[in-house]
Amino acid sequence: LRLLDHRALVCSQPGLNCTVKNSTCLDDSWIHPRNLTPSSPKDLQIQLHFAHTQQGDLFPVAHIEWTLQTDASILYLEGAELSVLQLNTNERLCVRFEFLSKLRHHHRRWRFTFSHFVVDPDQEYEVTVHHLPKPIPDGDPNHQSKNFLVPDCEHARMKVTTPCMSSGSLWDPNITVETLEAHQLRVSFTLWNESTHYQILLTSFPHMENHSCFEHMHHIPAPRPEEFHQRSNVTLTLRNLKGCCRHQVQIQPFFSSCLNDCLRHSATVSCPEMPDTPEPIPDYMPLW
């Protein structure tokens, strides 16, 4: 978790002098509770926006927006703490809006925005806006939270962001898999425009089951420049196991920008259709 272009952060608007500060996510009002505290934010909204860095890189950012309730507690509102918690790592990043002037009621509802939290593809975040000072231990909560899931690199708009392109999102291998005679699979895919090796990972499963009955790894050496964007064809030999008929083929590239953490593409071959007619029951039952 990080902020995009930290030096450009502003929160001032007409009628309010405000500054954005780094926060430890532990506001002083937790330790020294105040008697009078503001009400909670109203109508917290989160959207995915895209922002360029000064270097020209494009990153997904969380655009956070909220409004104030129209009650007298804005007289005691000293600012807001914005917190983004990445749910799978428990990493948290906070910033603080510090109001340098008192808020006054005016003809339209106060609205605040912040669009500088960089988010990662396919990650879920808990976004919280806490009004400051925070409430006394038994006081009514004065925060609003939402869980926000960022699209993965398969998403058309995410595909062209720097983190996705770095992990190989622009490569479309267009995998085809066909079953051949004599327990073989023919795998075909389009090579990318980089002289890097690939790995084909084959995992086979019984029909309707999820524990594998066969695994195989096949190494494909780095192509020469004249082979870029060409189809690579590989024939894999399967284990002759009855019922081990559903095959998942995964292609792992090793591009220089993502090494062994590149996006993988996969294709699945289903088991052949079973005939609907029931097996004939024999006229006699053997006794042994």
């Epitope: 909204q45 989160i46 899931l149």
Partner: nanobody
Framework: EVQLVESGGGLVQPGRSLRLSCAAS????????MHWVRQAPGKGLEWVSG????????DYADSVKGRFTISRDNAKNSLYLQMNSLRVEDTALYYC???????????????????RGQGTLVTVSS
């Protein structure tokens, strides 16, 4: 112009099933998360269920969990709600709604819904 057209509502007895459909047009359907919301007679809007752009995430209101299933077909620009074990309290006008921005929020959308259809009426009565 964004258009969302719901269908599939009707009068049904408690315990029976219905399948609602929503045909979407005027925007890139598979870019956006979608939701179902409902409005019971004389009540406000209630979020029912949501699904992410690629069907990777689905969430449900506690009142419908285990009974309703949300799904989508991006190739057909369509959203669905399979409603089983219907109850009298499920009676409402059901709306299909588009998430305003990209991304997905469980439990009611990331921001105010910018578009919804005209709704389809579900009446559960014996």
């Amino acid at each position: 112009e964004v258009q969302l057209v719901e269908s599939g509502g009707g009068l049904v007895q408690p315990g029976r099933s219905l399948r609602l459909s929503c045909a979407a047009s005027g925007f890139t359907f598979d870019d956006y998360a979608m939701h179902w919301v409902r409005q019971a007679p004389g009540k406000g809007l209630e979020w029912v269920s949501g699904i992410s752009w690629n069907s990777g995430r689905r969430d449900y209101a506690d009142s419908v969990k285990g009974r309703f299933t949300i799904s989508r077909d991006n190739a057909k620009n369509s959203l669905y709600l399979q409603m089983n074990s219907l109850r009298v309290e499920d009676t409402a006008l059901y709306y299909c709604v588009k998430e305003t921005g990209l991304g997905y929020c469980s439990g009611g959308g990331c921001s105010d819904f910018d578009y919804r259809g005209q709704g389809t009426l579900v009446t559960v009565s014996s």
